[in-house]
């Protein structure tokens, strides 16, 4: 799987997850968040090359597709697969409010 | 929605579904399918600017992150949302065979 | 050059479960259906059934319906014949074998080495 | 099914003989112009190798001496010249009906 255990240990230059740090207030201008101050959220990149943790039926015929015709542009593209949440606290006034994200987390990737 | 009403009608330069055709003796070496010998599988390419389309919190984020630090090189990327199947037909022996095959049409693409 | 290497020898029991593998390399295992074919000790060649790699699209002989199942891993080239309900008779060699690639049934060009299954209790 | 009927079950012959096997279908395995009849050739210990596909087309890298005729039902595999390396179990297969049927095997052993 191309999960943060493998792509974390390896020098892979195929679709992977990579590591990419947020801060809340400085990357996306977000100050009302009180904790956590950043997470990683990471993300996908890499080229997908024929086969690579395909997707879909789709998937593997576009990669297919590629391999036979290498002057085509149309390839598939590395992105998440699982992800997970991220629980913030912030104030509504001066009441604390915990809240859970959806999604918030790359924890692996495919070629889609 | 970036869908084949949309995207075929318009020149979009970002994220959207794009005509393929796909022959599948000529383009995938698969002698063995009678009916049809090709189809439009579509693919999605385009860029994802900040909230096209986003797939999910993560995406906006990263979306987000983007847009406020350009020279990062993590952004979303433009990946089929809706697919359809395709039927086709093939020989065993003499006998006809008819198979559905699952996510095969790219009908409208996300930014994930 | 196009090479078919399976899994080693395997000793089972009545009643039990062997799932053999074959690894493709050397063409684009995508375009072409894989067959399995056994062969008792002494004994002809015996047709399983079919896979084709892309689509996961499966025919079994009808003799195995039921009791086998094919399989492929497209991220390693690796196709699998899992075969249950073992009886004594189901003691042979199994061949992979990749159909030539003009129809779903076809001639066979390329072959596995083999991969022998002894049923005894 | 069909039944592939292939004969002599076995024959001695000696290098730089001529060698013909039959094979027998037991319904046409002809269909859209082509005759649906293969022929492959196994030595002990090893994997069946293609020699013949389509009845009479020789697989790359088989020699001359190998050939294949027929139609219908009835098919034959020659070998021109026999070679000390030919020795070895020859079987026919058809791939008109589901499932994909072959023969019982020729066996050609050294005089």
């Known amino acids: 799987a191309l999960d943060t255990n493998y792509c974390f240990r390896n020098l892979e230059e195929n679709c992977c997850v990579r590591p990419l740090y947020i801060d809340f207030r400085q990357d996306l201008g977000w100050k009302w968040v009180h904790e956590p101050k950043g997470y990683y959220a990471n993300f996908c990149s890499g080229p997908c090359p024929y086969l690579r943790s395909a997707d879909t039926t789709h998937s593997t015929v576009l990669g297919l597709y590629n391999t036979l015709n290498p002057e085509a542009s149309a390839s598939p593209c590395c992105v998440p697969q699982d992800l997970e949440p991220l629980t913030i606290l912030y104030y509504v006034g001066r009441t604390p409010k915990v809240e859970q994200l959806s999604n918030m987390v790359v924890k692996s990737c495919k070629c889609s | 929605a970036l869908d084949t009403n949309y995207c075929f009608r318009n020149l979009e330069e970002n994220c959207c579904v794009r005509p393929l055709y796909i022959d599948f003796r000529q383009d995938l070496g698969w002698k063995w399918v009678h009916e049809p010998k090709g189809y439009y599988a579509n693919f999605c390419s385009g860029p994802c600017p900040y909230l096209r389309s986003a797939d999910t919190t993560h995406s906006t984020v990263l979306g987000l992150y983007n847009t406020l630090n350009p020279e990062a090189s993590a952004s979303p990327c433009c990946v089929p949302q809706d697919l359809e199947p395709l039927t086709i037909l093939y020989y065993v022996g003499r006998t006809p065979k008819v198979e559905q095959l699952s996510n095969m049409v790219v009908k409208s693409c996300k930014c994930s | 050059q196009v090479q078919l290497v399976q899994s080693g020898a395997e000793v089972k029991k009545p009643g039990a479960s062997v799932k053999v593998s074959c690894k493709a390399s050397?063409?684009?295992?995508?375009?072409?259906?894989m067959n399995w074919v056994r062969q008792a000790p002494g004994q002809g060649l015996e047709w399983m059934g079919q896979?084709?790699?892309?689509?996961?699209?499966?025919n079994y002989g009808e003799m195995f319906e039921g009791r086998v199942t094919m399989t492929t891993d497209t991220s390693t080239s690796t196709a699998y014949m899992e075969l249950r309900s073992l009886r004594s008779d189901d003691t042979a060699v199994y061949y992979c074998?990749?159909?030539?690639?003009?129809?779903?049934?076809?001639?066979?060009?390329?072959w596995g080495q083999g991969t022998l299954v002894t049923v005894s209790s | 099914d069909i039944q592939m009927t292939q004969s002599p079950s076995s024959l001695s012959a000696s290098v730089g003989d001529r060698v013909t096997i039959t094979c027998r279908a037991s319904e046409s395995v002809d269909w859209w112009g082509n005759s649906f009849m293969h022929w492959y050739q196994q030595k002990p210990g090893k994997a069946p190798k293609l020699l013949i596909y389509l009845a009479s087309n020789l697989e790359s890298g088989v020699p001359s001496r190998f050939s294949g005729s027929g139609s219908g039902t009835d098919f034959t595999l020659t070998i021109s010249s026999l070679q000390p390396e030919d020795f070895a179990t020859y079987y026919c297969q058809q791939n008109i009906e589901d499932p994909l049927t072959f023969g019982g095997g020729t066996k050609v052993e050294i005089k």
């Open positions: 050397g063409y684009t295992f995508t375009s072409y259906w």
């Open positions: 896979i084709f790699p892309a689509l996961g699209s499966t």
């Open positions: 074998a990749r159909g030539i690639g003009n129809y779903a049934l076809d001639a066979m060009d390329y």
